[in-house]
């Protein structure tokens, strides 16, 4: 029986050109996480696997950073990044848990800023 629940950041907004942290939290289960997939609509952004580490989709390789923890940081945001994002937790023995986040990328400066990441 799947007892766990996924808590997400819900609906979030960020400024064009800025960055944002996408985070999900799995709770109320003792199941072990084996892998977390991050997807944008039907497109894979990243996979975090216990043994293989992080795989970042080639189309996002220069503007996606792992973390914090199992979260994902999106950088250099464009209006095209607006949309639904999903965290998919693969666990044993429970199975799969999915969380949803809606990101809106705004032109104005009223949106919240993301993390302090640097790309050399």
């Amino acid at each position: 029986m799947m007892t766990g629940t996924i808590e997400t950041t819900g609906n979030i907004s960020a400024e064009k050109g800025g960055s944002i942290i996408l985070q999900c939290h799995l709770s109320s289960t003792t199941a072990q996480v084996t892998q977390v997939n991050w997807e944008q609509q039907d497109q894979l952004l990243a996979i975090c696997n216990a043994d293989l580490g992080w795989h970042i989709s080639p189309s996002f390789k220069d503007r996606v950073a792992p973390g914090p923890g199992l979260g994902l940081t999106l950088q250099s945001l464009t209006v095209n990044d607006t949309g639904e994002y999903f965290c998919i937790y693969h666990t044993y023995p429970d199975g799969t848990y999915t969380g949803r986040i809606f990101l809106e990328v705004l032109e104005s400066s009223v949106a919240e800023h993301g993390a302090r990441f640097q790309i050399p």
Epitope: A65, G67, G69
Partner: antibody
Framework: QVQLQQSGPELVKPGSSVKMSCKAS????????MHWVKQQPGQGLEWIGC????????NYNEKFKVKATLTSDKSSSTAYMELSSLASEDSAVYYC??????????WGQGTLVTVSA | DIVLTQSPATLSVTPGDSVSLSCRAS??????LHWYQQKSHESPRLLIK???QSISGIPSRFSGSGSGTDFTLSINSVETEDFGMYFC?????????FGSGTKLEIK
């Protein structure tokens, strides 16, 4: 098996710089976030920052942003940390650690840095 | 930054005793908390991840509980090899921080 082999102890003069290494083996280095942690003698642990070798993206604890520079070399599976403008308070053991699903599952043996005139 | 407060600073116990170590976060970190053990002149070792999840190779006498702001590491029937320092760490957001540690010593 997973191993993190850190470089040997360093005795350095105040004001100078030091660059230490953390050579990884037994796992795909480029795909794992590598962290650095400071521990002064008899004290607790302080997170310095991390690097994702795949795209060289770094994240620093604000406290160490000027002090530390993190780099990596995928070809040799090695993470590096350079500390600049060294002072007595930089004397410490510095650990590298590999993240696994958000936890620091593997640690190097530590590099002791002693700053003394 | 999130502050993790560990208590007590030192815990003196006799082998065979069962003990509880506390870690309190300055804000809600959900279950994003790990526990590490560090023996003298050794590197830290991961004991418990995400507040309560066990780690392969770690004896079953170690267990963790809590979420939000209050967390506990329990050791059921302490053995001599368990003496040393214990640190909690959060990974809820940047920067990650550690607690100041609890020293488990022989009475």
């Amino acid at each position: 098996q997973v191993q993190l082999q850190q470089s040997g102890p360093e005795l350095v003069k105040p004001g100078s710089s030091v660059k230490m290494s953390c050579k990884a083996s037994g796992f795909p280095f480029a795909n794992h976030v590598m962290h650095w942690v400071k521990q002064q003698p008899g004290q607790g642990l302080e997170w310095i920052g991390c690097i994702f070798p795949f795209n060289e993206i770094t994240n620093y604890n604000e406290k160490f942003k000027v002090k530390a520079t993190l780099t990596s070399d995928k070809s040799s599976s090695t993470a590096y940390m350079e500390l600049s403008s060294l002072a007595s308070e930089d004397s410490a053991v510095y650990y590298c650690a590999r993240e696994q699903l958000g936890s620091f599952a593997y640690w190097g043996q530590g590099t002791l840095v002693t700053v003394s005139a | 930054d999130i502050v993790l407060t560990q208590s007590p600073a030192t815990l003196s116990v006799t082998p065979g005793d069962s003990v509880s170590l506390s870690c309190r976060a300055s804000q809600n970190i959900r279950s994003n908390l790990h526990w590490y053990q560090q023996k003298s002149h050794e590197s830290p070792r991961l004991l418990i991840k995400y507040a309560s999840q066990s780690i392969s190779g770690i004896p079953s006498r170690f267990s963790g509980s809590g979420s939000g702001t209050d967390f506990t590491l329990s050791i059921n029937s302490v053995e001599t090899e368990d003496f040393g320092m214990y640190f909690c760490q959060h990974i809820n957001n940047w920067p990650f921080t550690f607690g100041s540690g609890t020293k488990l010593e022989i009475k």
